[in-house]
């Protein structure tokens, strides 16, 4: 029997059965290549948590959510890579408060990249969970057009190109 | 599923390439890791790999150098391991993440015997 | 890198009875822990992702809990099929992604 390091439970009377199921459920889907679709499982999962959430080393709380700023610069579809690598998201802005927060912990002023881009599929700006923005809350500066993408500087929202390299941040 | 290949019996400071395959679907856009456990001994995690564009890969720090994980086709990823002792005799096992929210590792492969 | 400390290193209980398991993480990891089972000459099964989420056709008598670096879990009602070894692995979602395992702890089902 396999000891050692493990935990290793026996059944001193009686027979234990050895069989093992496996059930293949809740695979990754990539929409296009990008956007996943979150199973009801983790998604229930990771609300009733919110209360109580408690953030990796080197990530900020705030309001149930955990934000990682980064250090180095990427493209946004790479900085979106990224956040994905790491089961969270490009940020998401739902209002002036977490703007706001988002402002105070950024420690330069150059921009950085968000999960909003423009898609032509659409043609409109979208957040990266797939919902419009909110044009009553958030104006952004620039082009609306193909190969456009969302970063923030001094609370505002600009349109650059998608190519450029800024730093991110990603929430989860 | 997922199953691994490659095992064998190998002299010491040799090297040894090992394959999981999978059946049933494709390395799209997946995290797969390599696991490996030596006889009576617990798990222990040597890297991952995103098989996406990224193509990302990830080791514990013991075996960045020694081990590198590769994409090769839609539907193999390799590990191959160099520099080989007696401390690598294990089973190695190829896991892939399911997850979205979190890291779920459900499917496994039987795992491949190395013996050094 | 971030270690992840499994224990007791032995614990007992009887058919019908609890099994409690410990995992502690040397920094904050979040919820980002799962737990497997493992019986002999078989391949880790998945019984519990993001600390406390049950994985499918795992029996609610397997219970997880915890964040942040302090993590349990929990066999009720224990049955001679959960005769296994379990472990638990954390997660890192820093520059460089780690996924340790716990050492683990010897259960014996009298």
């Known amino acids: 029997l396999l000891v050692s390091q493990g935990v290793l439970l026996k059944c001193q009377k009686g027979s234990c059965s050895n069989a093992t199921q496996y059930e293949d459920t809740g695979d990754l889907k990539v929409n296009n290549g990008t956007r996943r679709n979150i199973s009801n499982k983790d998604l229930c999962a990771s609300r009733s948590a919110d209360q109580t959430v408690l953030c990796q080393s080197e990530w900020l709380k705030y309001q149930g959510k955990c934000y990682w700023f980064s250090n180095e610069m990427k493209s946004w579809s790479d900085s979106y890579v990224y956040c994905l690598e790491r089961k969270s998201h490009l940020l998401i802005i739902h209002d002036q408060l977490e703007m706001a927060f988002i402002q105070k912990n950024l420690r330069q002023l150059n921009y950085v990249w968000i999960g909003l881009n423009f898609t032509s599929l659409k043609m409109t700006w979208t957040w990266v969970d797939g919902s419009p923005i909110d044009s009553k809350i958030f104006f952004i500066k620039g082009p609306a057009k193909e190969n456009s993408c969302a970063a923030i500087k001094e609370s505002k929202i600009f349109s650059e190109t998608c190519s450029s390299v800024f730093k991110w941040i990603c929430q989860y | 599923s997922l199953e691994e290949s490659g095992g064998d019996l190998v002299q010491p400071e040799g090297s040894l390439t090992l394959t999981c395959t999978a059946s049933?679907?494709?390395?799209?856009?997946?995290?797969m890791c390599w696991v490996r456990q030596a006889p009576g001994k617990g798990l222990e995690w040597i890297g991952c790999?995103?098989?996406?564009?990224?193509?990302?890969t990830y080791y514990a720090s013991w075996a960045k150098g020694r081990f590198t994980i590769t994409k090769t086709s839609s539907t193999t990823v390799t590990l191959q391991m160099t520099s080989l002792t007696a401390a690598d005799t294990a089973t190695y096992f190829c896991?892939?993440?399911?997850?979205?929210?979190?890291?779920?590792?459900?499917?496994w492969g039987p795992g491949t015997l190395v013996t050094v | 890198d971030v270690v992840m400390t499994q224990t007791p290193a032995s614990v007992e209980a009887a058919v019908g009875g609890t099994v409690t398991i410990k995992c502690q993480a040397s920094?904050?990891?979040?919820?980002?822990l799962s737990w497997y089972q493992q019986k002999p000459g078989q391949p880790p099964k998945l019984l519990i992702y993001?600390?406390?989420t049950l994985e499918s056709g795992v029996p609610s008598r397997f219970k997880g809990s915890g964040s942040g670096t302090e993590f349990t879990l929990t066999i009720s009602d224990l049955e001679c099929a959960d005769a296994a070894t379990y472990y638990c692995?954390?997660?890192?979602?820093?520059?460089?992604?780690?996924?340790?395992f716990g050492g683990g702890t010897e259960v014996v089902v009298k």
């Open positions: 920094q904050s990891i979040g919820s980002d």
């Open positions: 049933g679907f494709f390395f799209s856009s997946y995290c």
């Open positions: 790999i995103y098989t996406g564009s990224s193509g990302s």
């Open positions: 993001g600390a406390s």
């Open positions: 692995q954390g997660t890192t979602r820093s520059s460089s992604i780690y996924w340790p």
């Open positions: 896991t892939r993440d399911a997850g979205t929210t979190y890291w779920r590792y459900n499917i």
